[in-house]
Structure formats: C-alpha cells, structure tokens
C-alpha cells in the first residue's frame, strides 16, 4: 500500500533526524498528503525557510559555526517581507548577527551562502555601515529608526538568528 | 560530532594522478554534504569541491573542473577526490570538510558553512 510505505518513510525520517533535532514540526503543504514541509521545535517558519533565535552570545564566527552544525547558516535576509517577520521574534534592547560580513574591510559585503549582495535591498540604520574595522553586520533596534542594521566588530559577543531550509519529508 | 580522516597525499610527479580519501565517523554519513579545500603555503584555504548527501549533485570550482572529481559511498562512509593531470600549483594541504544538510545540495563553498574538518593530508607536486 503506497500510503502505508510512505508513512513508514517518513517515520524512519523523523527517526534519523532526531540525532540533530530531538523534536520536528511538520505541516502538510498544499493539497497533496505526500508533502509535509518541518522545522525543528521550537523553531519559527516563514515561507520556506525556518528561523531559531540564538540567545547565546558568541562572536560571529562562532555564531555560525554554531548554526552550521544544526544544518543552517547565520540568517540571510532577503526581502522587507522576510526582516518584518524576523523582528517579531526578536527583543528590543538585544543586538543579533545576521550572516552578512566584509571580510577584507573594503565594503564587499556578503553573505555567507553567496547570496549576491543587493544594495537596493538592505537595511542599514543611517549612517550605516561607517567602520571599515567593523566587519560584520547586526540588526537591532533604535528607538529613532526601529529596526535596522549596523556594522560591528566580529569579535564582540552578540546573540544570532539562524536560518535554515525547511525539511520536507 | 563528525570526526573526519584524511588519506592518500604523498608526493607526486608533475602530470600524475592521486586519489585522496576522506573517511568519516560518528554522526550519520548520508545526512552530511561534503566538500575539499585547499591551503598552499601563504595562502588563503580555498574551495575545490562539494557533494550532496546522496551523491547526486556535484559542485567543483571552475579552474579545476577539468581535472578534478568528487564522488562518495555512503555505504564505506567515505568521501573521494580524484585529480588528474597534477602541477606544482596543485602543491597544497587538502582538506575534507562535512555540512549537515537536509536537502541535496551541493552548493557549499565556503569554509564558514562546513562545521566538522578533517586535519589534512599534503599533497606535494615535483616538476
């Protein structure tokens, strides 16, 4: 029976992604009972992708290093849409990496899953980024401006927003 | 965690082959993507390949496409480089890194992304 051999797929599934993520949350997408789109508990999900807000302080190195082992990456944002969403999860006397750096201090900003960097889509606070030394990008709030980005030193601890692929099984 | 064993360096006549290998442990095989990087000597590690999980999809730095293949078993839980046609520029220590990935992607070339690397094997090319 095709359903029954699916559902025992998607069991075993569950199963082997336990060893990284103990508890998934699954919906079914569309119409199709075969699709069901999950992001690790007690992630958030918006469109196809799947966010965990790092309450951690880590340097931006190790931020993503610690995304990159639950399979995702420091967040890449890519529309107003996607950053609207993103701030309502997060605090506003709190600063988070986003995975947006400039390695070589030359405004070359990228990001860390080569999404090309698209100065008609960003957003910086004014008057910024205003460092060449400070290398790697946050977001947080100022009361003047609500949600924007600044450029920052690397190394100085900061909470972090993950972002992964949502998992279909 | 994913502990990752290197293989098959040495040194090599300009024009040979080698296959290197990179033997992993621990976590499940199948759920990591995998790539090679490079160091020489005074230089930045760079990016030579990728892999999906399942081996389907492969992603190779463009100066190197020629020469160069990745491919896996997931049965052996080892993951292969071959490079053909070896120059002294090939002369560097190559690394195998491993990326979580829940999907089939092999669009993983950058060192930040990979959160498990191996110590290395040198590959040292004579003219």
């Known amino acids: 029976n095709f359903m029954y051999s699916k559902t025992v797929k998607r069991l075993s599934k569950l199963r082997e992604y336990q060893q990284y993520h103990p508890s998934l949350t699954c919906v079914m997408e569309g119409k199709d009972i075969e699709d069901w789109s999950c992001c690790p508990t007690p992630w958030t999900s918006f469109q196809s992708s799947c966010y965990f807000i790092s309450t951690g302080m880590q340097s931006w190195t190790k931020s993503q290093k610690n995304c990159s082992v639950m399979g995702a990456d420091l967040v890449v944002i890519n529309t107003r849409e996607e950053q609207d969403f993103i701030i309502q999860n997060l605090k506003r006397n709190s600063s988070y990496f986003l995975g947006l750096s400039d390695p070589g201090g030359r405004r070359h900003w990228q990001w860390v899953d080569q999404t090309p960097y698209n100065e008609n889509v960003t957003f910086w606070h004014s008057g910024e980024p205003n460092n060449l030394d400070e290398r790697c990008a946050i977001i947080n709030f100022r009361s003047s401006e609500e949600w924007g980005w600044n450029d920052i030193h690397c190394h100085v601890p900061q909470k972090s927003i993950c972002k992964m692929k949502k998992i279909y099984i | 965690q994913v502990q990752l064993q290197e293989s098959g360096g040495g040194l090599v006549q300009a024009g040979g082959s080698r296959r290197l290998s990179c033997a992993a442990s621990?976590?499940?095989?199948?759920?990591?993507?995998m790539g090679w990087f490079r160091q020489a000597p005074g230089k930045e590690r760079e990016f030579v390949a990728a892999?999906?999980?399942?081996?389907?999809?492969?992603y190779l730095a463009d100066s190197l496409k020629a020469r160069f293949t990745i491919s896996r078993d997931n049965a052996k839980n080892t993951v292969y480089l071959q490079i053909r046609s070896l120059n002294p520029e090939d002369t560097a220590v190559y690394y195998c890194?491993?990326?979580?990935?829940?999907?089939?992607?092999?669009?993983?070339?950058?060192?930040?992304?990979?959160?498990?690397w191996g110590q290395g094997t040198q590959v040292t090319v004579s003219s």
């Open positions: 890194a491993a990326r979580l990935s829940f999907d089939d992607s092999a669009y993983y070339t950058s060192t930040l992304r990979y959160a498990y």
């Open positions: 621990g976590r499940t095989f199948i759920n990591y993507a």
């Open positions: 892999i999906s999980t399942s081996g389907s999809n492969t």
